[in-house]
C-alpha cells in the first residue's frame, strides 16, 4: 500500500506564438482545479476507461480575474498535493491523465459551472520510494508543469511497496533470513504474510497473500506432493536415505494451465481443469458467455449459452466497445449551438448556453439587454449573444455593481506602491526602480554577467540569472 503524490507547479500558456485567451475575465472570474486519473501498466486506453489505480481531485484554486496591464500568464493554483492512495502493490509502470478544470463564478443560474480547459496524458516508469520526478506536458497552447512520486505507507517498503518492515525485536540484528530495512536502520524486513493455510514447510511467498510451492509440492497451499506415490514413482533417482524415489520434473511443474486452471497429471501428459469462462488444452481460450455478465454499463448481452457461441453486447446510449466499456464522447458532435458549452452527464447531455441564448441546445437567440440593468451608470451593450455592461469609471463586474480596485492584483513590482487614480492606477516606485509598473531596476548591482540581487530586491521578487 502507498500513495501517489502529484504537485502542480504551474499552468499557463506554453512558449511561442498563439497564446490562449485567459479563461477568466473581469466579467467572469473563475478558479482552477485539477483531476488526476491513474491506471496500471503502459496502457493506451481511452481517457474514459476506469482509473484502476485511483483518482483524485484537487481543492479549488484562488479566484482569478484577469487584470489588464499586468497580465498573469500562469494561473493561480490550488494549494497542496493531489494524493491517490493505492491499496495493492505499486505497478512500476503506469499511465496518467491530468485534467485542468475551470470553475466559472459568474452569477449563472444553478451555481458555478465547470468546463474542461486542458487534458494531458502520458505513460511513465516510476519506482516507489524514489525522488520527485519533474514533467512538462502541453495541451494545445497550454503548458502544465508538475512533479510526481510514489511512496509506500508503513509498514510497506521497496520499489513496489510489497516488502514489509517491522521494528526490530532484538537490538543488534534482524531475524534469520531477514534484511535490515534501508533507510530505516532500526527496522527489519518482516516475513511476508502468505495465503492463509500455505504450508510453512513446502510453501513460500514473494507477495502478500500468495502461496508458491517448493520443488516436489503442488496444490493451492503446497500440501500435495507432486507424485503421491513417490516411493513407487517411475521418475527420478533413488534416495539413499528413504529408499523412495524423489520426484523429478513432471508435466504439471510450473503449472501450464493459464487463467487460474488447475493441473493434474495423466499417464501420458497433463490435464487442465479450467475455471468458468475458459476452455482449451491450457485454459487459454476465453469461453465467456452471457451467463458471465460480460457487458458493462448496462449493456444487453445477446448470444448462445455454450462456449463456442459468441456473445454480442448491445450498448446503451453513451457507451461503445465490444463490452460497452468505452464512454462515447457525445460532446464531440458539438450539439450545443451558438457557442454553448456541452456537458456529458452520462445519463443525458446538457448545454450551458452563453448569455443571450437559451433552449436545450442553445438554439434560441434572446434579446441580450432585455430586462438587464447595468448599475452605477453603466450601459448595456448588445452583440454576439453576450449581454455586456460598459461600466462607468471606478466600477466593474458583470453588472457594474463592484467597485473596481485597480490595486488589488499588486500590479506594482519590486515593492512599488500602488495608488488608485481616476484614470486607472499609478505606481510609485521604490528607489532604484522605474517603469510604468516598477519592473525595471535602474542599476542592477554587480559588475559581471551574473550580478548579485539589487539592493531594492524584495523577498516577493526573487532573481533568476541564466
Amino acid at each position: 500500500a502507498g500513495v501517489f503524490e502529484l504537485q502542480i507547479h504551474s499552468f499557463g500558456p506554453g512558449p511561442g506564438p498563439g497564446a490562449p485567451r485567459s479563461p477568466c475575465s473581469a466579467r467572469l472570474p473563475c478558479r482552477l482545479f485539477f483531476r488526476v486519473c491513474l491506471k496500471p501498466g503502459l496502457s493506451e486506453e481511452a481517457a474514459e476507461s476506469p482509473c484502476a489505480l485511483g483518482a483524485a481531485l484537487s481543492a479549488r484554486g484562488p479566484v482569478y480575474t484577469e487584470q489588464p496591464g499586468a497580465p498573469a500568464p500562469d494561473l493561480p493554483l490550488p494549494d497542496g498535493l493531489l494524493q491517490v492512495p493505492f491499496r495493492d502493490a505499486w505497478p512500476g509502470t503506469f499511465s496518467f491523465i491530468i485534467e485542468t478544470w475551470r470553475e466559472e463564478l459568474g452569477d449563472q443560474i444553478g451555481g458555478p459551472a465547470w468546463s474542461l480547459l486542458a487534458r494531458v496524458a502520458g505513460r511513465r516508469r516510476l519506482a516507489a520510494g524514489g525522488p520527485w520526478a519533474r514533467d512538462i506536458q502541453r495541451a494545445g497552447a497550454w503548458e502544465l508543469r508538475f512533479s510526481y512520486r510514489a511512496r509506500c505507507e508503513p509498514p510497506a517498503v521497496g520499489t513496489a511497496c510489497t516488502r514489509l518492515c517491522r521494528p526490530r525485536s532484538a537490538p543488534s540484528r534482524c531475524g534469520p533470513g531477514l534484511r535490515p530495512c534501508a533507510p530505516l536502520e532500526d527496522e527489519c524486513e518482516a516475513p511476508l504474510v502468505c495465503r492463509a493455510g500455505c504450508s510453512p514447510e513446502h510453501g513460500f511467498c514473494e507477495q502478500p497473500g500468495e502461496c508458491r510451492c517448493l520443488e516436489g509440492w503442488t496444490g493451492p497451499l503446497c500440501t500435495v506432493p507432486v507424485s503421491t506415490s513417490s516411493c513407487l514413482s517411475p521418475r527420478g533417482p533413488s534416495s539413499a536415505t528413504t529408499g523412495c524415489l524423489v520426484p523429478g520434473p513432471g508435466p504439471c511443474d510450473g503449472n501450464p494451465c493459464a487463467n487460474g486452471g488447475s493441473c493434474s497429471e495423466t499417464p501420458r501428459s497433463f490435464e487442465c481443469t479450467c475455471p468458468r469462462g475458459f476452455y482449451g488444452l491450457r485454459c487459454e481460450v476465453s469461453g465467456v458467455t452471457c451467463a458471465d455478465g460480460p457487458c458493462f454499463n448496462g449493456g444487453l448481452c445477446v448470444g448462445g449459452a455454450d462456449p463456442d457461441s459468441a456473445y454480442i453486447c448491445h450498448c446503451p446510449p453513451g457507451f461503445q466497445g465490444s463490452n460497452c466499456e468505452k464512454r462515447v464522447d457525445r460532446c464531440s458532435l458539438q450539439p450545443c449551438r451558438n457557442g454553448g458549452l456541452c456537458l456529458d452527464l452520462g445519463h443525458a447531455l446538457r448545454c450551458r448556453c452563453r448569455a443571450g441564448f437559451a433552449g436545450p441546445r442553445c438554439e434560441h437567440d434572446l434579446d441580450d439587454c432585455a430586462g438587464r440593468a447595468c448599475a452605477n451608470g453603466g450601459t448595456c451593450v448588445e452583440g454576439g449573444g453576450a449581454h455586456r455592461c460598459s461600466c462607468a469609471l471606478g466600477f466593474g463586474g458583470r453588472d457594474c455593481r463592484e467597485r473596481a480596485d485597480p490595486c488589488a492584483a499588486r500590479p506594482c513590482a519590486h515593492g512599488g506602491r500602488c495608488y488608485a487614480h481616476f484614470s486607472g492606477l499609478v505606481c510609485a516606485c521604490a528607489p532604484g526602480y522605474m517603469g510604468a509598473r516598477c519592473e525595471f531596476p535602474v542599476h542592477p548591482d554587480g559588475a559581471s554577467a551574473l550580478p548579485a540581487a539589487p539592493p531594492g530586491l524584495r523577498p516577493g521578487d526573487p532573481q533568476r540569472y541564466l
Epitope: 513590482a413 510604468a436 519592473e439 541564466l466
Partner: nanobody, 117 residues
C-alpha cells in the same frame, strides 16, 4: 523557466546602426516586461530601454531619439534598434525579463557592442 538569448552585437563605426535581438523561451514575451541593459568596462550595469507587458516603452535620456525597443509576439523576441551610435555606447548589452506571475527576473548572457572607428 524563462531563457533569454541575445544576438546582433558586433563592431560598428560611430554614426552607424545595429539591431540587437533577444529570443525568449519558456514564456510568451507578451506576458513579460522586458528591457535592455548595458555594462561598459569598469562601470555599473544600467537600464537602457524597457517595454512593459502592456506595450508601453521607456528610455534613458542619453538614448532617447536614437534607440527604439520593440517586441514581436509571433517570433517571441524583443529588439533594440540602435541608430547614430557613439563611442560611449560601447558595452556588453544584456536582455532582461520580468515575469509578472512569478515575479522572477531573468537575464541573458549578453552581447558585445563596440563603437569605434
Amino acid at each position: 523557466e524563462v531563457q533569454l538569448v541575445e544576438s546582433g552585437g558586433g563592431l560598428v563605426q560611430p554614426g552607424g546602426s545595429l539591431t540587437l535581438s533577444c529570443a525568449a523561451s519558456g514564456s510568451s514575451v507578451k506576458f513579460l516586461s522586458m528591457a535592455w541593459y548595458r555594462q561598459a568596462p569598469g562601470k555599473k550595469r544600467e537600464l537602457v530601454a524597457g517595454i512593459s507587458a502592456d506595450g508601453s516603452t521607456m528610455y534613458i535620456d542619453s538614448v532617447k531619439g536614437r534607440f527604439t525597443i520593440s517586441r514581436d509576439n509571433a517570433k517571441n523576441s524583443v529588439y533594440l534598434q540602435m541608430n547614430s551610435l557613439r563611442a560611449e555606447d560601447t558595452a556588453v548589452y544584456y536582455c532582461y525579463a520580468y515575469r509578472w506571475h512569478t515575479r522572477y527576473t531573468y537575464w541573458g548572457q549578453g552581447t558585445l557592442v563596440t563603437v569605434s572607428s
